[in-house]
């Protein structure tokens, strides 16, 4: 039985390792970034820092056909507890004000790298 | 782009008040540490004050604590530095800027002269 453990189907993933993966994620796109990210659309900038994972990922996700940041809002639909749709608009959004893609990703990097330095994995 | 833009300088005699704001754009300025840097004409760069990104903690030379205060409001993307009591050698281009460790995070404004004298 305890050979027999290591078969078992994983728990869920710690929010350290989910956090870390996301961090990786975004580091791949902006060192592997060549052309403008998502032909530089524009999404709603941020204002606040609390509930900032369903935030980002309303913004996100207003950008479609976008293969690079596919992955990137899959994984920030696991930090938010509800069902963010395209076109939800957030109080945690700066109304009017857009900002590239690319500068969001940046930022967003930027921010979660503090997160995890601090150990707010959630 | 990336903008921040430095207002509020002026001429202003010894003992005197300003208020200087910086408006930032084009990125999200809630989740940078922010700080307010100055040139003294024939000098060079001097770090005055800085503000984390959540606005709780914040950071003073020792040349001005007590005297000036930063703030900011992130609802507004704005960057504040309150001056009283200023001196003849308060006299500078004030530059506000990101204040971040990482690489490529770097991001200065055009900067605001602010001239103490009588």
């Known amino acids: 039985l305890t050979c027999l453990g290591g078969f078992a189907s994983p728990g869920p993933v710690p929010p350290s390792t989910a956090l870390r993966e996301l961090i990786e994620e975004l580091v791949n796109i902006t060192q592997n970034q060549k052309a403008p990210l998502c032909n530089g659309s524009m999404v709603w900038s941020i204002n606040l820092t609390a509930g900032m994972y369903c935030a980002a990922l309303e913004s996100l996700i207003n950008v479609s056909g976008c293969s690079a940041i596919e992955k990137t809002q899959r994984m920030l639909s696991g930090f938010c507890p509800h069902k963010v749709s395209a076109g939800q608009f957030s109080s945690l959004h700066v109304r009017d004000t857009k900002i590239e893609v690319a500068q969001f990703v940046k930022d967003l990097l930027l921010h979660l790298k503090k997160l995890f330095r601090e150990g707010q994995f959630n | 782009g990336v903008q921040l833009l430095e207002s509020g300088g002026g001429l202003v005699q010894p003992g005197g008040s300003l208020r200087l704001s910086c408006a930032a754009s084009g990125f999200i300025f809630a989740w940078y540490d922010m700080g307010w840097v100055r040139q003294a004409p024939g000098k060079g760069l001097e770090w005055v004050s800085a503000?984390?990104?959540?606005?709780?903690?914040?950071y003073y030379a020792d040349s001005v604590k007590g005297r000036f205060t930063i703030s900011r409001d992130n609802s507004k993307n704005t960057l504040y530095l309150q001056m009283n009591s200023l001196r003849a050698e308060d006299t500078a281009v004030y530059y506000c800027a990101t204040a971040e460790d990482e690489p490529g995070y770097d991001y200065w404004g055009q900067g605001t002269l602010v001239t103490v004298s009588s």
């Open positions: 503000i984390a990104a959540k606005g709780m903690e914040t």
